[in-house]
Interface confidence: medium
């Protein structure tokens, strides 16, 4: 329209009016029910993981155990906030818990996201060192897999999630009866730059919390795969008749994390790209409507790991069985065998067979033929 032109015929409907956004309708109790289920399974499952890790003797713990424990701690601290989010969603986005819990529970979501992905990166790198460079990096692994690496990843996760703690607030928007828990950029941005802040934080969280860690992990697994492939070509081991899947639990953890968080990051990225590429309104609306479900799927990841351990790792299953019947006299005899292998210690899935240097079925396993057997997950 011309600068001095009359805009009498202009009815006020802006370009976005074709994009007729409406209040997002939650699917009743579906999302709150999933949140409560994740809370129940997550607290018991991750509590069990921590119990089995810390119950084992120090000597039995391997370098990866600290990452497994950290992963469980991250998930556990997050899932305890899920009843709050379930209530919020069920009340059609009315937050009754005050600003402190709005900030804290929002913060824990992102701390969990960062800490989890960093733990998986740590596990992957640990496996890389154990398999690709077992001798050269023995000392490095002792140092890296210790308290320093864990402290660094937690500090990093805590710092990266800090904008959420600062910017989250509760607001009685429009002075209606409902109070929302939302990101308020007004303290750091002008109205015109709020979107830039939202995009900036969104892109950085996806980059640092997903893209970069997964690039590192894929690189680690590429070299691991090369090493394992070369190893199987060169050697035939009596104890590995069925070519047991090495590293399966960590690979499954990583793949599960990727599958759970991919929709969240993908939809978020596509939505942000929409401001540049101007998606059709229907697609924009589709992204807005599926995002809560993508968020829900990402939260589900926090209760899955214990089930993955239970499914893929006999050692963890044994630890669980031990705990379930530890108070019963009939189990007293089975909880400790002469070899010490039935102590129900959960060594992050580093199965060493039924006994020291034993393959499946108890057959003798020569360590020289697979030097990293002590440190690698060997699962049927």
């Amino acid at each position: 329209m011309e600068e001095g032109g009359d805009f009498d015929n202009y009815y006020g409907a802006d370009n976005q009016s074709e994009c007729e956004y409406t209040d997002w309708k939650s699917s009743g109790a579906l999302i709150p029910a999933i949140y409560m289920l994740v809370f129940l399974l997550g607290t018991t499952g991750n509590g069990l993981v921590l119990w089995t890790v810390f119950r084992s003797s120090r000597e039995k713990r391997r370098s990866a155990d600290i990452f497994i424990a950290s992963l469980a701690v991250a998930d556990l601290t997050f899932v305890v906030t899920l009843p709050l989010w379930a209530t919020y969603t069920y009340r059609d986005y009315d937050w009754p818990f005050g600003t402190f819990f709005c900030k804290l529970s929002s913060y824990l979501i992102f701390v969990n996201m960062y800490a989890s992905v960093f733990c998986l990166t740590g596990l992957s790198f640990d496996r890389y060192l154990a398999i690709v460079r077992p001798v050269a990096n023995a000392r490095l692994r002792l140092r890296v897999s210790g308290a320093v690496a864990t402290a660094v990843l937690w500090v990093l996760a805590a710092l990266l999630a800090m904008p959420v703690m600062v910017l989250r607030t509760t607001g009685d928007l429009e002075n209606t009866t409902k109070v929302q828990c939302y990101m308020d950029y007004s303290m750091v941005a002008t109205v015109s730059s709020e979107w830039a802040w939202e995009v900036g934080l969104g892109v950085s969280s996806t980059t640092v919390g997903f893209v970069v860690p997964f690039t590192i992990m894929l690189t680690c697994y590429f070299f691991i795969a090369q090493t394992i492939a070369g190893h199987f070509r060169k050697e035939r081991i009596e104890g590995l008749r069925k070519r047991r899947r090495l590293l399966s639990i960590i690979v499954v953890l990583v793949v599960t994390f990727a599958l759970c968080w991919m929709p969240y990051h993908l939809v978020k990225t596509l939505y942000m790209l929409g401001s540049l590429l101007h998606w059709p309104c229907d697609f924009d609306l589709f992204l807005m409507n599926i995002f809560p479900y993508c968020t829900c799927i990402s939260y589900v990841n926090s209760c899955l790991n214990p089930f993955l351990y239970a499914f893929f790792d006999p050692r963890f299953r044994q630890a669980c069985t031990s705990m379930l019947c530890c108070g019963q006299s009939r189990c007293a005899g089975t909880s400790h065998s002469s070899s010490g292998e039935k102590s129900a210690s959960y060594s992050s899935g580093h199965s060493q067979g039924p006994g020291p240097n034993m393959g499946k079925g108890g057959e003798q396993m020569h360590e020289k033929s697979i030097p990293y057997s002590q440190e690698t997950l060997v699962v049927d």
Partner: antibody, heavy 129, light 107 residues
Framework: EVQLVESGGGLVQPGGSLRLSCVAS????????MSWVRQAPGKGLEWVAN????????YYVDSVKGRFTISRGDAKNSLYLQMKSLRAEDTAVYFC??????????????????????WGQGTTVTVSS | DIQMTQSPSSLSASVGDRVTITCRAS??????LGWYQQRPGKAPKRLIY???SLQTGVPSRFSGSGSGTEFTLTISGLQPDDFATYYC?????????FGQGTKVEIR
């Protein structure tokens, strides 16, 4: 063309009732909040009431609470204002307007009001004995 | 209720002039404010929303600024079409309230 057309205005005695209608066209009516705004002769604008898409939320200015009822008939693309116990001070031109909201992508339940972007031409209500 | 005080209530200006209208809120309303133009006998039109965002199709000579309690509408280079009454509207809380209006007249 996006359009709102009001009707139902007229002369009514104090204490009487009147029902205003507003028919929407050119947009998906049931996707929007809608408002009524009035303007007394020679005076400024006064927001009267608004209603959510599904009718689950309705807000009124204090001076009309208990007397006016805002409602909508999505099948007919219509907005209504039922006015009872009318007073002389209710004399005004009544405009219906479309409310424009932005919605937070991250924080569901959070909406940002962007004002009334489409207005009708108004219907005149005169309360006089 | 939040009171909106507009100043001046009327002003005289010439074509090409720069005009500034102020709106004060009785309490902080963040950026929850819009500006409307109304010509005699016509329906109001939205010019600015969210304090500073220009409505699509509105000439760029109109601009809005402010946050909290003080807001301004600026018309840089007044055109003949711009002689009208301007209202601010707060939508931070219910009931929504308009300023009393500023009438811009030809000098």
């Amino acid at each position: 063309e996006v359009q709102l057309v009001e009707s139902g205005g007229g002369l009514v005695q104090p204490g009487g009732s009147l029902r205003l209608s507003c028919v929407a066209s050119g947009f998906t009516f049931n996707n929007y909040w809608m408002s009524w705004v009035r303007q007394a002769p020679g005076k400024g604008l006064e927001w009267v009431a608004n209603i959510k898409q599904d009718g689950s939320e309705r807000y009124y200015v204090d001076s009309v609470k208990g007397r006016f009822t805002i409602s909508r008939g999505d099948a007919k693309n219509s907005l209504y204002l039922q006015m009872k116990s009318l007073r002389a001070e209710d004399t005004a031109v009544y405009f219906c307007a479309r409310d424009r909201f932005g919605y937070s992508f991250y924080d569901k339940g959070v909406r940002y009001y962007y004002g009334m972007d489409v207005w009708g031409q108004g219907t005149t209500v005169t309360v006089s004995s | 209720d939040i009171q909106m005080t507009q100043s001046p209530s009327s002003l005289s200006a010439s074509v090409g002039d720069r005009v500034t209208i102020t709106c004060r809120a009785s309490q902080g309303i963040r950026n929850d404010l819009g500006w409307y133009q109304q010509r005699p006998g016509k329906a109001p039109k939205r010019l600015i929303y969210a304090a500073s965002s220009l409505q699509t199709g509105v000439p760029s000579r109109f601009s809005g600024s402010g946050s909290g309690t003080e807001f301004t509408l600026t018309i840089s280079g007044l055109q003949p079409d711009d002689f009208a009454t301007y209202y601010c509207l707060q939508h931070n809380s219910y009931p929504r309230t308009f300023g009393q209006g500023t009438k811009v007249e030809i000098r």
